[in-house]
C-alpha cells in the first residue's frame, strides 16, 4: 500500500493562473497511489462541483483535471485538488485570477530596435521589447531588394522572415546576427502581433568595412609590417 503522490509535479509548478476573461482554464493534479486514489476539488475551501457556474465545469478523473470554459471574474479564487486513498491524502492549491483589462494591440518600446552600426565580422544584437495582454507572436523581418526594387507592385516592401517566436508578455526578444557582412546591412523590422492586431518598428543596420590594420592609429605599426 502507498499513500497518494504526485506523478508529474513539474506540470504543477505554475501555481498562479492569470487569464483573460472568456478563456478556458485547466488545472491538473496527476497522482497515483495504492489503492488508486480519488480526486475532488475545492474552491476557496468549499466543495466545488460547478453547479452555480454558467457553463458548469468538466471533471476528468482519469486525467486528474478540472476544466472551466469561458471564465468570468466570479471564477477568481483558490482551487484545491484533494487526492486521497485509505493510506493518506495530499493537496495542492492553484490561484486563479481573471483579467478584465481591455486587450490591446502589442505595444513596442520606443527606440527599439535601435539603429546600429557594426564592423564586418562582428556580432550584432537587435532588441525588441513587447507589451501585450494577449499572448504575442513576433517576427523579425529584413527588408530586401528583388529585381532592383525594394517594393512590390502593391506598394508594400519586400521582406524576408528571419525569425518567428511566440513569447510571453513583456519579454525582450533578441535577433542575433553573427559575423556580419556588408550584405547584412539594411532595414530590420520587429513585428509583434496578437489576436487584436499587429504593431511593428524598424531600425537600420550599417555595416562598416573591416578596419585596415595598416592605418589603425591605436595599433603599433611594427605589428603589421612584413
Amino acid at each position: 500500500q502507498q499513500a497518494p503522490y504526485w506523478t508529474h509535479p513539474q506540470r504543477m509548478e505554475k501555481k498562479l493562473h492569470a487569464v483573460p476573461a472568456g478563456n478556458t482554464v485547466k488545472f491538473r493534479c496527476p497522482a497515483a497511489g495504492n489503492p488508486t486514489p480519488t480526486i475532488r476539488w475545492l474552491k476557496d475551501g468549499q466543495a466545488f462541483h460547478g453547479e452555480n457556474r454558467i457553463g458548469g465545469i468538466r471533471l476528468r478523473h482519469q486525467h486528474w483535471s478540472l476544466v472551466m470554459e469561458s471564465v468570468v471574474p466570479s471564477d477568481r479564487g483558490t482551487y484545491t485538488c484533494l487526492v486521497e486513498n485509505a493510506v493518506g491524502s495530499i493537496r495542492y492549491n492553484y490561484l486563479l485570477d481573471v483579467l478584465e483589462r481591455s486587450p490591446h494591440r502589442p505595444i513596442l518600446q520606443a527606440g527599439l530596435p535601435a539603429n546600429t552600426t557594426a564592423v564586418v565580422g562582428s556580432d550584432v544584437e537587435l532588441l525588441c521589447k513587447v507589451y501585450s495582454d494577449a499572448q504575442p507572436h513576433i517576427q523579425w523581418l529584413k527588408h530586401i531588394v528583388i529585381n532592383g526594387s525594394s517594393f512590390g507592385a502593391d506598394g508594400f516592401p519586400y521582406v524576408q522572415v528571419l525569425k518567428t517566436a511566440d513569447i510571453n508578455s513583456s519579454e525582450v526578444e533578441v535577433l542575433y546576427l553573427r559575423n556580419v557582412s556588408a550584405e547584412d546591412a539594411g532595414e530590420y523590422t520587429c513585428l509583434a502581433g496578437n489576436s487584436i492586431g499587429l504593431s511593428y518598428q524598424s531600425a537600420w543596420l550599417t555595416v562598416l568595412p573591416e578596419e585596415d590594420p595598416t592605418w589603425t592609429a591605436a595599433a603599433p605599426e611594427a605589428r603589421y609590417t612584413d
Epitope: L191, I196, L198, Y200
Partner: antibody, heavy 124, light 112 residues
Framework: EVQLLESGGGVVQPGRSLRLSCAAS????????MHWVRQAPGKGLEWVAV????????YYADSVKGRFTISRDNSKNTLSLQMNSLRVEDTAIYYC?????????????????WGQGTMVTVSS | DIVMTQTPLSLSVTPGQPASISCTSS???????????VYWYVQKSGQPPQLLIY???NRFSGVPDRFSGSGSRTDFTLKISRVEAEDVGVYYC?????????FGGGTKVEIK
C-alpha cells in the same frame, strides 16, 4: 478568391442554444485571428468575440461573456460560435470577419474581409 | 471601452457635391507604432460592411480616390469629394486598437 461563409442561423427560443459556423477559403486560415460581429435589425454594428490564429486566446464583449464561446478548427478552415442561454437581444445578423494575420501586412491587418452573415432570431 | 461618436446621423447630398462625416473617439487611437487605428466602412442595403479606409487615411484596394480619411488622435473625418449615386449607404467608423472593438453609430448617406 478570399471568402467567408456563415451558416447555422435560425429561429430559437430564449434560453436555448445555437451554434454558428463560418467556412473560410482562399487564404491561409490558420495564420489569421478571426472575429464575430453582429448587427441587430435596423441597428449598428457590435463586436462579439475574437480568437487568435491558434485558438489560444479568446476575448468577448461583456454582453455575451459566459454565454458565448468562440472556437476554431484549423484543419477544417472553420470558425464557430456556440451561443448558449440566448436572449431576445441576441437577435441579429452575425458576421464572420477576418482579423490580423501573422506576417507583414500588405494592407490592413485585418477587418478587411466579411462574410455575408447569418440571421439569428431569438423569440418566444 | 472606447466610445465612437459619429455625426451627422444622416446626410442628403446632391450628386457631384462633397460630403463629410465626422467621428470622435473617447480615447486617442494613436498607437505607439505611430499609426492611428481608425477604420471606415460603408454598408449598402442587404450587404455586409465594406472597408473603405484603414489606419486613418489609407484607401483599401479598389476604393475610388474620391474617398479620403483624415484626422488625428481623437477626431476623424471621412470625405467624399464628389458623391455618386452608388455611394448611398450607411457609413461607420471603427476603432481597431483594443478590445472590445467599437463602431460609431453610423451615418446614412442618401442622394437628393
Amino acid at each position: 478568391e478570399v471568402q467567408l461563409l456563415e451558416s447555422g442561423g435560425g429561429v430559437v427560443q430564449p434560453g436555448r442554444s445555437l451554434r454558428l459556423s463560418c467556412a473560410a477559403s482562399g487564404f491561409t486560415f490558420s495564420s489569421y485571428a478571426m472575429h464575430w460581429v453582429r448587427q441587430a435589425p435596423g441597428k449598428g454594428l457590435e463586436w462579439v468575440a475574437v480568437i487568435s490564429y491558434d485558438g489560444s486566446n479568446k476575448y468577448y464583449a461583456d454582453s455575451v461573456k459566459g454565454r458565448f464561446t468562440i472556437s476554431r478548427d484549423n484543419s477544417k478552415n472553420t470558425l464557430s460560435l456556440q451561443m448558449n442561454s440566448l436572449r431576445v437581444e441576441d437577435t441579429a445578423i452575425y458576421y464572420c470577419v477576418r482579423g490580423a494575420g501573422r506576417g507583414y501586412p500588405h494592407g490592413p491587418d485585418g477587418f478587411d474581409i466579411w462574410g455575408q452573415g447569418t440571421m439569428v432570431t431569438v423569440s418566444s | 471601452d472606447i466610445v465612437m461618436t459619429q455625426t451627422p446621423l444622416s446626410l442628403s447630398v446632391t450628386p457631384g457635391q462633397p460630403a463629410s462625416i465626422s467621428c470622435t473617439s473617447s480615447r486617442s487611437l494613436l498607437h505607439s507604432d505611430g499609426k492611428t487605428y481608425v477604420y471606415w466602412y460603408v454598408q449598402k442595403s442587404g450587404q455586409p460592411p465594406q472597408l473603405l479606409i484603414y489606419e486613418l487615411s489609407n484607401r483599401f484596394s479598389g476604393v475610388p480616390d474620391r474617398f479620403s480619411g483624415s484626422g488625428s488622435r481623437t477626431d476623424f473625418t471621412l470625405k467624399i469629394s464628389r458623391v455618386e449615386a452608388e455611394d448611398v449607404g450607411v457609413y461607420y467608423c471603427m476603432q481597431y486598437i483594443e478590445a472590445p472593438l467599437t463602431f460609431g453609430g453610423g451615418t446614412k448617406v442618401e442622394i437628393k
